[in-house]
Interface confidence: medium
């Protein structure tokens, strides 16, 4: 007799999912020497630890501490790079700008990054077929937990300078309801970070307004000064100048505002 | 890491000349773009001037511009330079050198700090 599954309004868990885990574990770790020591046959087992057997509506971030404790990694505090709504853009620029990081250049991030994976209560199964969407069936799903446990512990990492790069072409420019409006700016810590720089990416060739004069910035402004960190706001008013600038910054047409 | 060390200020009148000088220590220098910055009492610290690492590219607050020059040295590139001509007394700050590791515009982010220099500009 076939097991009754339940159904979730999201797809499911993302195929050869536990092979993917492993093996970008073993390619960051070959790639990054801070992180040799990872043993990635455990760090894929603390994952699986966290989800399998669980109701994937009932996941919580202590689900996810022996994960975090062996992915645990320093990165340098005043280089972090946040992000919202423009994934793509912030991770070719942490490419070219080698010295800055994602959550996604962490190891935690990569082995996640663009993945889906939730499991079944009381069985060892991981679910191909569907996984909670996080609005129409629950948030505290494993994808969604893992996010805003890490998201949370990278903002709280950051000093100084914290940069976030930001998609002038969304009707809010800031969303509270992002991972970034939601975790990251709240677990900012103001003994550590003097500024929040955002950059607030066009996406129209013509486009020359003053979107940091965006309501959902000022927004973004005063959420930012009422916990006494400071907020600076600058247009990058065309991307793939930009990203040309930060491969070449002596190139003649980088001497202009970008 | 990088040591920076400002050195050049003093008490002038208005409309004289100073040049500051920083010296840089440490890891190879060439790479790091630099600025000054000043901090006058009670107020913000403020950019005045940046230069991109080759000495390509400067920029200039507005306040100081066609008056204040940044320059490196060209041989030993471990020194910048502010020359700065038609002081005025709302000039008179504390400057501070300041270097990254990379140059663009639009960051505030600056790795590496000097301890400043006095300039007093009196009327």
């Known amino acids: 007799v076939p097991r009754w599954r339940q159904q979730w309004s999201g797809p499911g868990t993302t195929k050869r999912f536990p092979e993917t885990v492993l093996a970008r574990c073993v390619k960051y770790t070959e790639i990054h020497p801070e992180m040799r020591h990872v043993d990635c046959q455990s760090v894929w087992d603390a994952f699986k630890g966290a989800f399998i057997s669980k109701h994937p509506c009932n996941i919580t971030e202590e689900d996810y501490q022996p994960l975090m404790k062996l992915g645990t990694q320093t990165v340098p505090c005043n280089k972090i790079l946040l992000w919202s709504r423009i994934k793509d853009l912030a991770h070719q620029f942490t490419q070219v700008q080698r010295d800055m990081f994602t959550l996604e250049d962490t190891l935690l991030g990569y082995l996640a990054d663009d993945l889906t994976w939730c499991g079944e209560f009381n069985t060892s199964k991981i679910n191909y077929q569907s996984c909670p969407d996080w609005r129409k069936d629950c948030s505290n799903n494993p994808v969604s937990v893992f996010w805003k446990t890490v998201s949370r512990r990278f903002a709280e990492a950051a000093c100084d300078v914290v940069h976030v790069m930001l998609n002038g072409s969304r009707s809010k420019i800031f969303d509270k309801n992002s991972t970034f409006g939601s975790v990251e700016v709240h677990n900012l810590q103001p003994e550590k970070v003097q500024t929040l720089e955002a950059w607030v990416i066009h996406g129209g060739r013509e486009d020359s307004r003053d979107l940091c004069q965006d309501p959902t910035i000022k927004e973004l402004e005063s959420i930012i000064s009422k916990r006494n960190i400071q907020f600076s706001c600058k247009n990058i008013y065309r991307p793939d100048k930009f990203l040309q600038c930060v491969k070449n910054p002596e190139d003649s047409s980088c001497t202009s505002e970008i | 890491d990088v040591q920076l060390v400002e050195s050049g200020g003093g008490l002038v009148q208005a409309g004289d000349s100073l040049r500051l000088s920083c010296a840089a220590s440490?890891?190879?220098?060439?790479?790091?773009?630099m600025a000054w910055f000043r901090q006058a009492p009670g107020k913000e610290r403020e950019i005045v001037s940046s230069?991109?690492?080759?000495?390509?590219?400067?920029?200039y607050a507005d306040s100081v511009k066609g008056r204040f020059t940044i320059s490196k040295d060209s041989a030993k590139m471990n020194t910048v330079y502010l020359q700065m001509n038609s002081l005025e007394p709302e000039d008179t700050a504390v400057y501070y050198c300041?270097?990254?590791?990379?140059?663009?515009?639009?960051?505030?982010?600056?790795?590496?700090w000097g301890q400043g220099t006095q300039v007093t500009v009196s009327s």
């Open positions: 230069i991109s690492t080759s000495g390509g590219i400067t920029d």
């Open positions: 300041a270097a990254r590791t990379w140059y663009l515009r639009t960051s505030l982010q600056y790795d590496y």
């Open positions: 440490g890891r190879t220098f060439s790479s790091y773009a």
